[in-house]
């Protein structure tokens, strides 16, 4: 038998200690929210939120404005002084809860923790390729505000989620906030509400459709928005909750709510619960049936799937999949499995169990003892009955009313417990050529470019590196511009390529070649890189023979 | 003192195509939205779209997406509209008029008016 | 699109008199309603903006009033300068939409 060259180890093909510096920025306080903006005639930025200031960065992350937006009742507070003279509310320090795109005009609007969670409108102005941001409007009409009704409240200051929708030419705000009673009471935010911008942006249209927690449960059922989207004609809201309104706050779940995007209403408002899994290919004694459940949602992102993952999932290439990382739970116990697992929810997949929930609920014969659950949002009613009825009502539809769906979606960690130790905290999901590509921040501090498949039972990665030497949590926000992502940790935003920072990583010629083309790397002499980096000989195709 | 010069009369012809002015002065361009109006011989007014100087962002009344379209040149701190496909029923007066799309504010100075005739 | 129905078509007054024009909205849009002045030959000139807010440089006679669907423009002592039509606008919705207009006749 001929001789061959020792295989080197996988592990050992790789060096993930490698140093890469990637652009970063200096925020000056813990980053709170962070948005791009990508105009059409190449202009670019990236909005960065810390307590008290809006900063406005060019796509190379350097400082281009920056908008004192806090404390109020402060002389110095630029957004407090669009309102006109004050005193507007208690002082105190604002907190960006909010930060989005109004699309019409092109303009952002941010909303803060302070002044009853009103927003303010700033216009666009590209100046080159860099965007400036014209002096603040306030979207707030006193007289139109109360307390007990508040159209212009939007921020919760324990977190609100914005999705802004295009209906006509009117823009829609879908707004979803977290309670408790002392938040409820003052300036009365919702929990799911769909707010219009008025045409002259003197705030929102009064008489605007919501769902709130229910007063006798608010102190003990309280919902954090996770992540919110809009993809075809639904806006998705996804959710941690108490799993059950009697035992609350008892163990958690996940859910995902849908709103029409098409219609501002909320009578085919629905909700599925979402239950992800870690299924080891074999089974230790005493694990439950099914999978180990990690009911907590962490983060999430949906995007396109490439070519494979669309193969694997049964789904066609370029369908939207929602992605989310998920974790077990404070109360769930010694586990033995990863820290985090990560789950794929195909979005058609999900209207489809949500189309077939309302079908259960409202086509005859409906299935005695069925509930139309949601409890904590409205009164209690068994399927096909309209909430806190006791029989249908002729005139008023099954489908009208908000639902919980009696099923709920049940998927497998597409890592096959391979992220093991590691605590995702943040998540971002790319297309590149016919692959997907998790881009993920870590609780260290790190960011893993992981390629998404089912079949493998190891980690493609595309890179694994340290953002720096603070090891702070990566936070939950992340944008991308262009062919980058910007990602937050600390008081840090950092610029991330998404075919990767480099390729020094890989020590191997061999492995070298075999990254995905979209990472450009190639073997140069000694070591792995783009061929930018490369002054000599650069192959992409054989590597040299081994001596 | 705020101004806003329009282009003067034009007679055209039917399914030609034209473009009116409306030059601004004594204030920021940048800073309002340029509205414009349509006022038809029953007197009636039609708002017939804006755009932002600020960032050329426009939004039309559907009525005349294709019929109108709105441009500036900040540089001369001008707004243009330039109306296409012209018929009989596109005779009227139209307006500029500025506008602060904020909370507070109205079309506050409108232009002398641009009439256009359209005839064969 | 949001209606704005003006009436009456025509109002005739005696100088010194006071007059209302009316506007209806066909659904609720807050305040968010300017009503124009425009004379004969001229150009729309903006009397009064949010129902109720007066514009420097405008008579202090003219006056408003109203929210949410129903809305009053009022001139408190008519002048024989004051002959033009009148119309009202909102900018609650897209589009802006202006009322077919009020006008003033002087007896």
């Known amino acids: 038998k001929e001789w061959q060259c020792p295989r080197t180890p996988y592990a050992a093909s790789r060096d993930f200690n490698v140093k890469y510096m990637v652009p970063s920025f200096s925020a000056g306080g813990l980053v709170q929210t962070m948005v791009t903006y990508q105009g059409d005639k190449n202009e670019s930025a990236v909005f960065v939120a810390i307590r008290n200031r809006l900063h406005v960065l060019g796509p190379d992350l350097k400082s281009v404005q920056s908008l004192a937006t806090g404390p109020a009742g402060d002389p110095g507070c630029q957004t407090c002084a669009a309102c006109g003279p004050g005193p507007h509310g208690p002082s105190g320090d604002t907190d960006t809860k909010v930060l989005v795109l109004e699309p019409a005009l092109p303009a952002l609007v941010s909303c803060g923790s302070s002044l009853q969670g009103r927003c303010f409108l700033h216009d666009l102005d590209p100046q080159g390729t860099a965007v400036h941001l014209a002096a603040p409007a306030c979207l707030f009409s006193a007289h139109h505000n109360r307390p007990d009704d508040c159209p212009d409240c939007v921020a919760s200051p324990l977190g609100t989620r914005v999705t802004v929708v295009e209906q006509g030419q009117a823009s829609y705000f879908y707004v979803a906030s977290s309670l408790d009673a002392a938040v409820a009471a003052s300036f009365s935010p919702r929990s799911v509400s769909i707010r219009r911008l008025k045409a002259d942006a003197s705030g929102f249209a009064p008489g605007f459709v919501a769902l709130s927690v229910l007063p006798k449960h608010l102190v003990s059922y309280s919902i954090e928005y996770v992540h919110s989207f809009h993809t075809g004609a639904f806006v998705y809201f996804l959710t941690v909750q108490p799993a059950s309104v009697t035992d609350a706050p008892g163990a958690l779940h996940t859910r995902l709510a849908r709103l029409s995007a098409t219609e501002p209403e909320l009578g085919d408002y629905r909700e599925l619960v979402l239950d992800c899994r870690f299924a080891p290919k074999r089974r230790r004694r005493g694990a439950p049936e099914g999978g180990q459940p990690y009911p907590v949602l962490r983060v999430a992102h949906s995007a396109p799937v490439g070519a494979q993952l669309a193969t694997e999932l049964s789904i066609a290439e370029g369908q939207e999949v929602l992605f989310g990382v998920f974790v077990a739970g404070k109360d769930s116990g010694p586990g033995v499995g990863p820290n985090s697992v990560v789950c794929a929810f195909p979005i058609d997949l999900l209207d489809t169990l949500i189309d077939e929930g309302v079908e259960r609920c409202c086509e005859s014969p409906v299935h005695p003892g069925l509930r139309r659950g949601l409890d904590f949002f409205q009164s209690p009613s068994f399927c096909p009955n309209p909430p806190g009825l006791e029989a249908p009502s002729p005139n008023t539809s099954c489908r009208h009313f908000p639902l919980l769906v009696s099923s709920s979606f049940s998927r497998v960690d597409l890592f096959n417990g391979l992220l093991g130790t590691v605590e995702v905290t943040a998540l971002y999901v790319t297309r590149l050529d016919n692959v997907t590509v998790a881009h993920m921040g870590t609780a260290d501090g790190r960011i893993l470019q992981v390629e998404l498949a089912r079949s493998l039972n190891y980690l493609l990665y595309v890179s694994n590196f340290s953002l720096g030497d603070s090891g702070q949590p990566v936070q939950r926000d992340v944008s991308r511009l262009g062919d980058h992502l910007f990602f937050a940790s600390g008081d840090q935003v950092f610029q991330v390529p998404i075919q990767g920072p480099g390729c020094r990583h890989f020590l191997t010629c061999g492995r070298c070649l075999r990254a995905q083309r979209f990472m450009g790397c190639g073997w140069c002499g000694n070591m792995c890189g783009r061929q930018k980096e490369c002054p000599g000989s650069w192959q992409q195709d054989h590597c040299p023979p081994k001596l | 003192e705020v101004q806003l010069q329009q282009s003067g009369p034009e007679l055209v012809k039917p399914g030609a195509s034209m473009k009116i002015s409306c030059k601004a002065s004594?204030?920021?361009?940048?800073?309002?939205?340029m509205n414009w109006v349509k006022q038809s011989h029953g007197k009636k007014l039609e708002w017939i779209g804006l755009i932002n100087p600020y960032n050329g962002g426009t939004i039309y009344n559907q009525k005349f997406k294709g019929k109108a379209t709105l441009t500036v040149d900040k540089s001369s701190s001008t707004a243009y509209m330039e109306l296409l496909s012209l018929t009989s029923e596109d005779s009227a007066v139209y307006y500029c008029?500025?506008?602060?799309?904020?909370?507070?504010?109205?079309?506050?100075?409108w232009g002398q008016g641009a009439s256009v005739t359209v005839s064969s | 699109d949001i209606l704005l129905t003006q009436s009456p078509a025509i109002l005739s007054v005696s100088p010194g008199e006071r007059v209302s024009f009316s506007c209806r909205a066909s659904?609720?849009?807050?305040?968010?309603i300017h009503w124009y002045q425009q004379r004969t030959n001229g150009s729309p000139r903006l009397l009064i903006k949010f129902a109720s807010e007066s514009i420097s440089g405008i008579p202090s006679r003219f006056s408003g009033s109203g929210s949410g669907t129903d809305f009053t423009l009022s001139i408190n002592s008519v002048e024989s300068e004051d002959i033009a039509d009148y119309y009202c606008?909102?900018?609650?919705?897209?589009?802006?939409?202006f009322g077919a207009g009020t006008k003033l006749e002087v007896k």
């Open positions: 004594g204030y920021s361009f940048t800073g309002y939205t």
């Open positions: 659904q609720s849009i807050g305040t968010s």
């Open positions: 008029a500025r506008w602060l799309r904020r909370g507070g504010y109205a079309m506050d100075y």
């Open positions: 606008q909102q900018s609650d919705s897209w589009p802006l939409t």
